[in-house]
């Protein structure tokens, strides 16, 4: 039993690191292997990861974390039984994926504005709670090329834009997602998507 | 908001004991170090112990064997168990959150060792 | 044990002024591991520098740290009246802990 593709660990930058590798063959990852993972600290004690399969030869790993600090590094032992496959090492604040925000509402009833709010996913006393931006998608039901994407680039976890920048009488769907430059992170995944009936009413045209 | 809220100083007797206690809030307490610092009148800081997520554990010299420090998840809340206490010993008494610096701190309570 | 020394013990300086403190430690410390701290009479010790250099949340930019192995240097740029306070490096080492300098007043000229 071997290694073919080695872990490779991205943080959610709060209590969840999750690794994925592949075996050289099928592998029931569950029952044949085990991830051991360790915070190189005074305080710190061995953990054990029991890895779910990630299609025949995956293997992924849900890691359990102290809150992370910019500091932290972990030692990482892939085990099978009593053969050591792999040792290696892994800093969360290097790899980070950011929690999806939530709780995406569009309100609809501010005279023709659309007011988007969503959640910032993480708690004040969090790094990334003052240092994350967000990319809006709204698309249209009906209209597959009716398709934008709004950059929030500033701390307030909202969006404004004119209802009439979109169809009316059509319906819409919206969702978000997060990145923090300060850590050069990944995207995080969407968050779920809300949808609205978007009518406004047309200015009396002037002839 | 975070906070730490500390309570149990006050006056006692050499060779006495005393437990102080930090209550968390605010934070996720069971995923977090936790620490007691010292600072006695006019004087530094001075660490004086650390208790990780697991349980593990780790003294300043000078509290050795002397005091114990715990905590109870359940209860979001930091122990520090004193006994033999020394004229030495009497000082400002902080908890902390943290791991390799001290971001949180409690308000302090003061310990004083005299007869 | 590592002990760090901080120097001067006392800066006697005026609003405006810059301040530079020294932390120097008895054998090399990792940058990821210092701190500095500002005490004011009566109250707990404040976060503003971690990792040697990054500000903690909050913290103006006035203060600013640097420095690594043995020699870390905490700066401030110009004195505000609410800067007078005492100020602690401190460190963390995996094998001996935590250990803080004895502080450097900073106080009115």
């Known amino acids: 039993m071997k290694v073919l593709q080695e872990p490779t660990c991205v943080s959610d930058y709060m209590s969840i690191s999750t690794c994925e590798w592949k075996m050289n063959g099928p592998t029931n990852c569950s029952t044949e292997l085990r991830l051991l993972y360790q915070l190189v600290f005074l305080l710190s004690e061995a953990h054990t990861c029991i890895p779910e399969n990630n299609g025949g030869a995956g293997c992924v790993c849900h890691l359990l974390m102290d809150d992370v600090v910019s500091a932290d590094n972990y030692t990482l032992d892939l085990w099978a039984g009593q053969q050591l496959l792999w040792k290696g090492s892994f800093k969360p604040s290097e790899h980070v994926k950011p929690r999806a925000p939530g709780n995406l509402t569009v309100h609809t009833n501010v005279s023709d504005t659309l007011l988007l709010t969503w959640s910032n996913p993480y708690p004040p006393d969090n790094y990334l709670y003052n240092h994350l931006t967000y990319a809006v998608n709204i698309w249209s039901e009906n209209d597959p090329a009716d398709f934008r994407i709004y950059n929030v680039t500033y701390l307030e976890p909202s969006l404004r834009i004119a209802a009439s920048t979109l169809k009316s009488g059509i319906s819409y769907r919206a969702r978000v997602r997060a990145w923090a430059q300060c850590y050069n992170t990944t995207w995080s995944e969407w968050s779920p998507s809300t949808k609205w009936h978007n009518s406004y009413r047309e200015p009396f045209e002037q002839h | 908001e975070v906070q730490l809220v500390q309570s149990g100083g006050g006056l006692v007797h050499p060779g006495g004991s005393l437990r102080l206690s930090c209550a968390g809030s605010?934070?996720?307490?069971?995923?977090?170090?936790m620490f007691w610092v010292r600072q006695a009148p006019g004087k530094g800081l001075e660490w004086v112990s650390g208790?990780?997520?697991?349980?593990?554990?780790s003294y300043a010299d000078s509290v050795k064997g002397r005091f114990t420090i715990s905590r109870d998840n359940a209860k979001n809340s930091l122990y520090l168990q004193m006994n033999s206490l020394r004229a030495e010993d009497m000082a400002v008494y902080y908890c902390?959150?943290?791991?390799?610096?001290?971001?949180?701190w409690g308000q302090g309570t003061l310990v004083t060792v005299s007869s | 044990e590592i002990v760090l020394t901080q120097s001067p013990g006392t800066l006697s300086l005026s609003p405006g002024e810059r301040a530079t403190l020294s932390c120097r430690a008895s054998?090399?410390?990792?940058?990821?591991?210092l701190a500095w701290y500002q005490q004011k009479p009566g109250q707990a010790p404040r976060l503003l520098i971690f990792?040697?250099?990054s500000r903690a949340p909050g913290i103006p930019d006035r203060f600013s740290g640097s420095g690594s192995g043995t020699d870390f240097t905490l700066t401030i740029s110009r004195l505000e009246p609410e800067d007078f306070a005492v100020y602690y490096c401190?460190?963390?080492?995996?094998?001996?802990?935590?250990?803080f300098g004895q502080g450097t007043k900073v106080e009115i000229k």
């Open positions: 990792g040697a250099s």
């Open positions: 605010g934070f996720t307490f069971s995923r977090n170090a």
């Open positions: 902390a959150r943290g791991r390799y610096y001290f971001p949180w």
């Open positions: 401190q460190q963390y080492d995996h094998s001996a802990g935590w250990t």
């Open positions: 054998q090399s410390v990792s940058s990821s591991y």
């Open positions: 208790i990780g997520t697991g349980g593990a554990t």
